[in-house]
Amino acid sequence: LRPSRVHNSEENTMRALTLKDILNGTFSYKTFFPNWISGQEYLHQSADNNIVLYNIETGQSYTILSNRTMKSVNASNYGLSPDRQFVYLESDYSKLWRYSYTATYYIYDLSNGEFVRGNELPRPIQYLCWSPVGSKLAYVYQNNIYLKQRPGDPPFQITFNGRENKIFNGIPDWVYEEEMLATKYALWWSPNGKFLAYAEFNDTDIPVIAYSYYGDEQYPRTINIPYPKAGAKNPVVRIFIIDTTYPAYVGPQEVPVPAMIASSDYYFSWLTWVTDERVCLQWLKRVQNVSVLSICDFREDWQTWDCPKTQEHIEESRTGWAGGFFVSTPVFSYDAISYYKIFSDKDGYKHIHYIKDTVENAIQITSGKWEAINIFRVTQDSLFYSSNEFEEYPGRRNIYRISIGSYPPSKKCVTCHLRKERCQYYTASFSDYAKYYALVCYGPGIPISTLHDGRTDQEIKILEENKELENALKNIQLPKEEIKKLEVDEITLWYKMILPPQFDRSKKYPLLIQVYGGPCSQSVRSVFAVNWISYLASKEGMVIALVDGRGTAFQGDKLLYAVYRKLGVYEVEDQITAVRKFIEMGFIDEKRIAIWGWSYGGYVSSLALASGTGLFKCGIAVAPVSSWEYYASVYTERFMGLPTKDDNLEHYKNSTVMARAEYFRNVDYLLIHGTADDNVHFQNSAQIAKALVNAQVDFQAMWYSDQNHGLSGLSTNHLYTHMTHFLKQCFSLSD
């Protein structure tokens, strides 16, 4: 009896998570990504805000920029020039969209210990970066690109046609930022800084989304964003390259678009420099199942860029769209013409291929019923990549090294056995020539970041182990988590179940399904998190489940492309199927089942509630899409085609939430949206609400004034408090 008595007394000193813990970020973790500046040196901002240079080989470190200097301009970020002479300091950060922001920039001269005076940068700047060699500066101000040969020099203006909401140079417009590039920039230096490539986006003909921003003034402001919804006019993109050594000599030269792409609407998808005089561009047809990779060379005689047809590589999908979420980008080898790239193999799994001349003759480097996720680095003798191969858990990420210098190439898992229980989901960051690398483990245990030797893989030191977090969690009753799979009709449904600390299989628990379910997403991942659903399990005794159904990623094309051209069908079916299986497990109170989701998850949760199954008592949709006609062209058409009669209009029409208004009658529905959502427009929820009112269906709603898709700041606290009350009421849990 003694051991169990001791155990009980220990349990009594432990407490459940509170909502306050979650909202205060009490149990958040830290990661450590070195800011590499050479093969063996990196910069890091210390706890007291000094910028410190660490030398791995000497074990020494020294401060190159003091917190006093940082504070003098209220700097929140910095960037060292590659020649190590200057640092830009970034302040007055002002967020725009997901990645974009404007800021004020100051240049500090390290050799002289003072700020560069004269020819100061204008403000606010939309994007600024150093050349990869030396200390040239490229920046975007008021949608135009400028170049400085040295920080103190006067700027050279490269473009002149930039205009707010019309012409964007060197930065993406809204849709390219969010759905194609996933960056705040659209300019790329060549490896030695000789050339600068940039995109020009012409949004002149794009319809504008307009919404009110209420602010504090007597009259609200109207925010106008050129935003192409499905089927609308898209931005017109052009790529230019300028010689930065003699920028005025011939000026920007346009890079030609492959003929097979230019014949109809198209997108530019990415640019990769190979050498200073060779560049690789990727293009995509508007119907996103054909991608063309084009390798272009500089013609010294004409001062132009030549993209021969023989250097065009076509990637086409016959079962879905091209690529995963995005078309993958190439990683070039040292010969500067062959490259490594991830795309679907003949069995429909995304794997690394080596392309030397044609895609048809590609050599497959990895294979199996799993997927290669990311190529981190290719050196003379090694290729480092991540995959979910290990032990056949799709929600894990391990780092592998393939020796490409030897034949046959040998493969080694670098991370699989390092901290096997604690660490099953890794990413990595490599120094020059992969001399050293940092591993960042995200869980399932407490995250840890470590430094390793690139040749031996030996761990050199722990960079961040989250000791404070570990100590803080010692007296917390965390929920139990398990990742398992259901086999249903030849479909594997992986799920994560979060169980109350004293879970007892013989008892009945309320169930909350948390869903995202968007194409090429993955919710069931072996990562650490102490969040709202952890609290619901720990304190409120709920079981929470996340299920990856059809349309989700990293388990092969059959699952991924199952949703092609019919969003809103199988994702919902698979959540429902999983719920039925969970009920069969015997510990779920089938009268107390709820579902909730955000964004795409709000769409799926709404459709699940309106499925007429009677399974769900209540549910929440936060910032849901309600009709694919309301969402961005680039994203929507990738999966749905066009909303035209001769394409897929019918499914656009019958996959709306509004069409199911009648079915909400028998559920409790909470609809939530920010009025300043630039991404999933408030229009989506306004239309749901209108349809429910017209159908005389009662529902609950909450709007967040002037909040975007993230519902950040004080809205977050209000949101989670509100949703907690709603769920507790639904599940008859006392407050």
């Epitope: 050479s38 093969g39 063996q40 040196e41 240079l53 030398n55 080989e57 000497t58 020494q60 020294y62 401060t63 190159i64 920029l65 003091s66 200097t69 060292l80 190590r84 002479q85 390290l110 050799s111 210990g113 020059d432 001399k435």
Partner: nanobody, 117 residues
Framework: QVQLQESGGGLVQAGGSLRLSCAAS????????MGWYRQALGNQRELVAG???????YYPDSVKGRFTISRDNDKNTIYLQMNSLKPEDTAVYYC???????????WGQGTQVTVSS
Amino acid sequence: QVQLQESGGGLVQAGGSLRLSCAASGSIFVGNAMGWYRQALGNQRELVAGITSDGTTYYPDSVKGRFTISRDNDKNTIYLQMNSLKPEDTAVYYCNLWPPRIGFASWGQGTQVTVSS
């Protein structure tokens, strides 16, 4: 106290050559990136060459192809071989960590290089 001792400067005709040396105390030299800097009268100090511990080098365009930085790890010394010198190369030349360390009175006396036309 860390010591950096530059030497090898002098007066030279345009087109001529000089080889500068910088002896550093071990604690600072071993494994660290080092640089040669110069300061002409009335101008800011600027980098002319940098070398990492593994021998990777950097030169600004103004000296590329004319100057060569090297290091002898056994002797804790870095060198700057300067060829095809021009009058505009006239300056006091210093060695230091690359980038320099703050709050560290590391700039030595330097060595004067004068290129006459």
